[in-house]
């Protein structure tokens, strides 16, 4: 990673997953080791992300396992890059009226999307559901990330940064739990009744404010429109 990276030394240590959610399914944005970006129906080690806020609503998104920044080319294709280019790897974050988040390139104006079509963001537009995201805390045990949590006094600082360049696995104070309004009791994923609000189990876990260290009421996200 270049020294100029805005991610190195970040004090925000929470891993989150960005996912799209329609009435019946959800896909988690994942950045693979080869830089390919796609969606998975469940949390994976490649969908564990770190999101860092910058000024004026800009964010930088990084795949923890791939150690790649989420970037966009001039055609609107998203990809993961080891190199941080401020023009291609920063996104404008906006929360829509429905509470879902959209991310678009200030350089090329295209939306970050798990759909294959490339669409420019226009104020007031209603993007397709695969361009609207919710966030969710990481539920994958850190051991699955295959990156040892550095043990104190046993490795040099250089070793630590090499094994954990994004500083996401070092022990930190736990994030504040989501407020009660964000973490209601949900029905079983196998509940097929028409009133089951989360039949695919995709909204388990409290919503998080993905761009700050803790969650307050402003960190709540709507529950997806599940039957």
């Amino acid at each position: 990673y270049p020294n100029a990276s805005p991610l190195l030394g970040s004090s925000w240590g929470g891993l989150i997953h960005l996912y799209t959610a329609t009435a019946r399914n959800s896909y988690h944005l994942q950045i693979h080791k080869n830089g390919h970006v796609d969606g998975a129906p469940h949390q994976t080690i490649y969908s564990a992300l770190m999101i860092r806020s910058e000024d004026a609503g800009f964010v930088v998104i990084t795949g923890v396992m791939s150690r790649r920044y989420l970037c966009m080319d001039f055609r609107g294709n998203i990809f993961g890059s080891h190199y941080f280019d401020p023009e291609n790897c920063r996104f404008q974050h906006q929360t829509l009226e429905n509470g879902y988040d959209v991310y678009h390139s200030p350089q090329y104006h295209f939306l970050v999307s798990l759909g294959r079509a490339k669409r420019a963001f226009l104020p007031g537009m209603n993007p397709p559901p695969y361009s609207q995201f919710l966030s969710r805390r990481n539920e994958i045990p850190l051991i699955h990330f295959n990156t040892p949590i550095p043990r104190r006094h046993t490795q040099s600082a250089e070793d630590d940064s090499e094994r954990d360049p994004l500083n996401v696995l070092k022990p930190r104070a736990r994030m504040t739990p989501a407020p009660a309004s964000c973490s209601q009791e949900l029905p079983s994923a196998e509940d097929n009744s028409p009133m089951a609000s989360d039949p695919l189990g995709v909204v388990r876990g409290g919503r998080v404010n993905t761009h700050a260290g803790g969650t307050g009421p402003e960190g709540c996200r709507p529950f997806a429109k599940f039957i």
Epitope: T22, N25, G39, P41, A117, R119
Partner: antibody
Framework: QVQLVQSGAEVKKPGASVKVSCKAS????????MHWVRQAPGQGLEWMGI????????SNAQKFQGRVTMTRDTSTSTVYMELSSLRSEDTAVYYC??????????WGQGTMVTVSS | AIQLTQSPSSLSASVGDRVTITCRAS??????LVWYQQKPGKAPKLLIY???SLESGVPSRFSGSGSGTDFTLTISSLQPEDFATYYC????????FGPGTKVDIK
């Protein structure tokens, strides 16, 4: 190449159950939701339900609540759809289809289920 | 749930004709609309996704347009292999299909 291969045609009596299988190959099975869609003779397409391949969680169209059960076997990359309490109006071709976020890109060849006394 | 209506329900056309099929959603669905072609005894085939994006391998005579509630599938010059039934499907909320439009030979 991606392939979805379904089980063969079935003839069932009213009140019985039928279980249709769909074996996936050519891609990572757990990376895509699978849907079931049916088509009665001379009629349109009707979405029945969806299954999450990794968790096995399912969600069905309200019309089929309580009658349809979708399961999967990750070891064989196969999804199953069981429809119970069959009636004559369940006579249809049943399709499995792979979800790729913005469309169903691959479909099985279809399984004809005939319900007749 | 969002309902889709297609018009016409059937049409007769000749090879070389320009054919237009419309799909209307009961509420706005952004661009989350797909078009499929189905021939007798066969599974549906994906033609258009995200309202106006052509699926790989589909001839360029097929095109889609629209956003919100009104969508159109156009075949610029009908070919013999295009006689089939066409379905729209929305991806905004559930996965509802339209009732279909049958295109047959005049």
């Amino acid at each position: 190449q991606v392939q979805l291969v379904q089980s063969g045609a079935e003839v069932k009596k009213p009140g019985a159950s039928v279980k249709v299988s769909c074996k996936a190959s050519g891609y990572t099975f757990t990376n895509h939701y699978m849907h079931w869609v049916r088509q009665a003779p001379g009629q349109g397409l009707e979405w029945m339900g969806i299954i999450n391949p990794i968790s096995g969680s399912t969600s069905n169209a309200q019309k089929f609540q309580g009658r349809v059960t979708m399961t999967r076997d990750t070891s064989t990359s196969t999804v199953y759809m069981e429809l119970s309490s069959l009636r004559s109006e369940d006579t249809a071709v049943y399709y499995c289809a792979r979800d790729i976020v913005d469309a169903f890109d691959f479909w099985g060849q279809g399984t004809m289920v005939t319900v007749s006394s | 749930a969002i309902q889709l209506t297609q018009s016409p329900s059937s049409l007769s056309a000749s090879v070389g004709d320009r054919v237009t099929i419309t799909c209307r959603a009961s509420q706005g669905i952004s661009s989350a609309l797909v078009w499929y072609q189905q021939k007798p005894g066969k599974a549906p085939k994906l033609l258009i996704y995200d309202a106006d994006s052509l699926e790989s391998g589909v001839p360029s005579r097929f095109s889609g347009s629209g956003s919100g509630t009104d969508f159109t599938l156009t075949i610029s010059s009908l070919q013999p292999e295009d006689f089939a039934t066409y379905y729209c499907q929305q991806f905004n909320d559930y996965f509802t299909f339209g009732p279909g439009t049958k295109v047959d030979i005049k």
